[in-house]
């Protein structure tokens, strides 16, 4: 992949001193896994397992690798060209509107609803009304309202081991 990231793509506080105008789009850029030296002459490798860059760039520093939080598992480690990939532990999920933390999946659906989707690292269980088939809003019901899987139902991947 030969997409480019230049100083202009960064927030003002991340930018280095302005570079001279380049005669071709990639002149003066360094490959993924590298950053440019302060004098703009050399390409310096990112530090394996510590930082990375994903595109051709003129960054003065590589980007710091993400550390997986507790409650997350590391799917793949940080390399010089790819950030760490973290995923919520089994039984938890990360919502788009609260990506900063993993939330516990519900253990069952409210009364009058059936489960049609399992807990995954990126979504809670999915419930629909038995009759209408419309989805539930997703609020966790009171415990006494919860309908849990019957003994004959296969356990979902997000069933909590307690």
């Amino acid at each position: 992949e030969s997409a480019l990231i230049t100083q202009q793509d960064l927030a003002p506080q991340q930018r280095a001193a302005p570079q001279q105008k380049r005669s071709s789009p990639s002149e003066g850029l360094c490959p993924p896994g590298h950053h440019i030296s302060e004098d703009g002459r050399d390409c310096i490798s990112c530090k394996y397992g510590q930082d990375y860059s994903t595109h051709w760039n003129d960054l003065l520093f590589c980007l710091r690798c993400t550390r997986c939080d507790s409650g997350e598992v590391e799917l793949s480690p940080c390399t010089t060209t790819r950030n760490t990939v973290c995923q919520c532990e089994e039984g938890t999920f990360r919502e788009e509107d609260s990506p900063e933390m993993c939330r516990k999946c519900r253990t069952g659906c409210p009364r009058g609803m059936v489960k049609v989707g399992d807990c995954t690292p990126w979504s809670d269980i999915e419930c629909v009304h038995k009759e209408s088939g419309t989805k539930h809003s997703g609020e966790v019901p009171a415990v006494e309202e919860t309908v849990t899987s019957s003994p004959g139902t296969p356990a979902s991947p997000c069933s909590l081991s307690g």
């Epitope: 992949e1 030969s2 480019l4 071709s24 789009p25 990639s26 002149e27 850029l29 490959p31 993924p32 896994g33 590298h34 030296s37 002459r41 050399d42 390409c43 310096i44 490798s45 530090k47 394996y48 051709w56 010089t80 060209t81």
Partner: antibody
């Protein structure tokens, strides 16, 4: 499998230019950086520069910057290294080499080498 | 430029011996060190990169270690086909530089 096949040996006079080719096969040509490394008789290895066919990015060793031209023809998956103003100390085997992975600049695949002799 | 100083420059050893070659960088190269084997009239062959990662197909008797400025290539039990010249390389910063080589000869 990955192969880098270089052009044949050359004999040149001091002050002349030489153009060495390196034809790549067995992988997507535009995905990997190609490097040029030379080795004078009985001596060690010296990095000349790289060419990345994906965006025509070139990085040259300052020592050769004014004399080396790196180009490519993507239609034939061939990279070229031209060295001008040749002198006797440029007598060496010139190798093209490909990165082992996309952007880690260590060289897992090498051409067979092209001997360039500079002699009056 | 980063200088890579390799030692020894030559070494005599016997089949079955354990051999160690060292490389010292003039500055920290953050484990971005590679090792190559070269036989006369042939192109170099990559053995190790990122200081300790063995290249595909390289026998397990070859191992690399080190960090900062000091790197080592070890051959645990020399085989007849291992007699060759070995080079270290820093792949940390352009211009990439190599050690001057260690010629491993049969005792």
């Amino acid at each position: 499998q990955v192969q880098l096949v270089q052009s044949g040996a050359e004999v040149k006079k001091p002050g002349a230019s030489v153009k060495v080719s390196c034809k790549a096969s067995g992988y997507t040509f535009t995905d990997y950086i190609i490097h040029w490394v030379r080795q004078a008789p009985g001596q060690g290895l010296e990095w000349i520069g790289w060419f990345y066919p994906g965006n025509n990015n070139i990085k040259s060793n300052e020592k050769f910057k004014d004399r080396v031209t790196l180009t490519a023809d993507t239609s034939t998956s061939t990279v070229y290294m031209e060295l001008s103003s040749l002198r006797s100390e440029d007598t060496a085997v010139y190798y093209c080499a490909r990165n082992e992975d996309n952007y880690g600049n260590f060289f897992g695949y090498w051409g067979q080498g092209t001997l360039v002799t500079v002699s009056s | 430029d980063i200088q890579m100083t390799q030692s020894p420059s030559s070494l005599s050893a016997s089949v079955g011996d354990r051999v160690t070659i060292t490389c010292k960088a003039s500055q920290d190269v953050n484990t971005a060190a590679a090792w190559y084997q070269q036989k006369p009239g042939k192109a170099p062959k990559l053995l190790i990169y990122w200081a300790s990662t063995r290249h595909t197909g390289v026998p397990s008797r070859f191992s690399g270690s080190g960090s900062g400025t000091d790197y080592t290539l070890t051959i645990s039990s020399l085989q007849p086909e291992d007699f060759a010249t070995y080079y270290c390389q820093q792949h940390y910063s352009t211009p990439y530089t190599f050690g001057q080589g260690t010629k491993l000869e049969i005792k």
